[in-house]
């Protein structure tokens, strides 16, 4: 049994880290492998993750890491029974992938303006709470080429756009994702999308 692609891990920097790797051949990850992880700290326990399959040879493990701080460093040991397949380490603060924003809502009754709001996925006492900025993706349900990204470079989880910038009488969808520039994070997954009908009508022109 051999590791083809070594585990790579990302952390949501609140309670969970996710590690993925590939084996040399088809593997029943949960039956054959265990990922042992331990905070490098004198009295920390050695916890263990039972991996799940991610494709025929791919494995994924979700590691519980509460109360994360910048200095936290974990040792990782991948075992097949009593055989150590791989040994490594992981510093959550250096591999941040934020949680996806939540509760995306579109308000269409704000005079010719669309108001999109969502919630920051972190509690106010978390390090990432004030570090997140966002990207909003809006697209036409019937026309995949009619898609746009709005960068929300401020921290307030809202976006206002003129309804006139979208086609009238068309159903649109929106989704939002987050990143933390100061942590050099990757982008979060996209939030679930929300749908609305753009009923905006062009003002009647006088000649």
């Amino acid at each position: 049994m051999k590791v083809l692609q070594e585990p790579t891990c990302v952390s949501d920097y609140i309670s969970l880290s996710t590690c993925e790797w590939k084996m040399g051949g088809p593997t029943n990850c949960s039956a054959e492998l265990r990922l042992v992880y331990q905070l490098v700290f004198l009295i920390s326990e050695t916890n263990m993750c039972v991996p799940e399959n991610n494709g025929a040879a791919g494995c994924v493990c979700h590691l519980f890491m509460e109360d994360m701080v910048g200095a936290d460093n974990y040792t990782l040991d991948l075992w097949a029974g009593q055989q150590l397949l791989w040994k490594g380490s992981f510093k959550p603060s250096e591999h941040v992938k934020p949680k996806a924003p939540e509760n995306l809502t579109v308000y269409t009754n704000v005079s010719e303006t669309l108001l999109l709001t969502w919630s920051n996925p972190y509690p106010p006492d978390n390090y990432l709470y004030e570090k997140l900025t966002y990207a909003v993706n809006i697209w036409n349900e019937n026309d995949p080429t009619d898609s746009r990204i709005y960068d929300v470079t401020y921290q307030e989880p809202t976006l206002r756009i003129a309804a006139s910038t979208l086609k009238s009488g068309v159903s649109y969808r929106a989704r939002v994702r987050a990143w933390a520039q100061s942590y050099n994070s990757t982008w979060s997954e996209w939030s679930p999308s929300t749908k609305w009908y753009n009923a905006y009508k062009e003002p009647f022109e006088k000649h």
Epitope: S15, I43, N47, M48, C49, V50, E66, D67, Q82
Partner: antibody, heavy 129, light 109 residues
Framework: EVQLVESGGGLVQPGGSLRLSCAAS?????????MCWVRQAPGKGLEWIGC?????????YYASWAKGRFTISRDNSKNTVYLQMNSLRAEDTAVYYC????????????????????WGQGTLVTVSS | IQMTQSPSSLSASVGDRVTITCQAS??????LAWYQQKPGKAPKLLIY???TLAYGVPSRFSGSGSGTDFTLTISSLQPEDFATYYC???????????FGTGTKVTVLG
């Protein structure tokens, strides 16, 4: 110093109730581990009662014999875990230990305790009339 | 899950090699720990994950086994090792933790 300190033990009449406390110091009680209770009757072996996950998912596990009469709870703001014992009987007389435990998890929803690494000094509960 | 520990007691001399066994009633992989307890004291963790030595535990203690059969070995018994030893098995199918009945190690003679 990292330690667990139990309190609340004492003499209680059969049928009575008692709440034991376990105060954690030197580490955050809300970090990634389980907090558990284990008891030992005089001259007998160790007996697991149950555990509560200290982090954001407060999942609990109990020994089958403890379900219903024994309840484990926590107050992370006080770094304290509790054991509420009801309908006490003479056979519940024991030293009650608080212990911190490692865990095994599968996915994000299945997480269970699997060994006790750090123990308190224990508190004696005597059930007698 | 049931944990059958044997022997229940044994007498030995300083320097002896001591072996204690623990048998689980179902496959518990390597979810087994060993503890040492002295009178009036809390148990002390010796071994976890069947064979991993806990921090600060002397190397004369070792553990082996997986599945249903496990062994704790003290390679050369020291005066401070006279105590009661317990195994602890964990079943993730039920989330339960069960201790063995204990093995009391006393001084021979």
């Amino acid at each position: 110093e990292v330690q667990l300190v139990e309190s609340g033990g004492g003499l209680v009449q059969p049928g009575g109730s008692l709440r034991l406390s376990c105060a954690a110091s030197g580490f955050s009680s809300s970090s990634a581990h389980y907090m558990c209770w284990v008891r030992q009757a005089p001259g007998k072996g160790l007996e697991w009662i149950g555990c509560i996950y200290a982090g954001s998912r407060g999942s609990t596990y109990y020994a089958s014999w403890a379900k219903g009469r024994f309840t484990i709870s926590r107050d992370n703001s006080k770094n304290t875990v509790y054991l509420q014992m009801n309908s006490l009987r003479a056979e519940d007389t024991a030293v009650y230990y608080c212990a911190r435990a490692a865990f095994v998890n599968r996915g994000v929803s299945w997480i269970w305790p699997y060994y006790f690494s750090l123990w308190g000094q224990g508190t004696l509960v005597t059930v007698s009339s | 899950i049931q944990m059958t520990q044997s022997p229940s007691s044994l007498s030995a001399s300083v320097g002896d090699r001591v072996t204690i066994t623990c048998q689980a009633s179902e496959d518990i992989e390597s979810y087994l720990a060993w503890y040492q307890q002295k009178p009036g004291k809390a148990p002390k963790l010796l071994i976890y994950r069947a064979s991993t030595l806990a921090y600060g535990v002397p190397s004369r203690f070792s553990g082996s086994g997986s599945g249903t059969d496990f062994t704790l070995t003290i390679s050369s018994l020291q005066p401070e090792d006279f105590a009661t030893y317990y195994c602890l098995g964990s079943s993730y199918s039920t989330g339960s933790n069960i201790f063995g009945t204990g093995t009391k190690v006393t001084v021979l003679g």
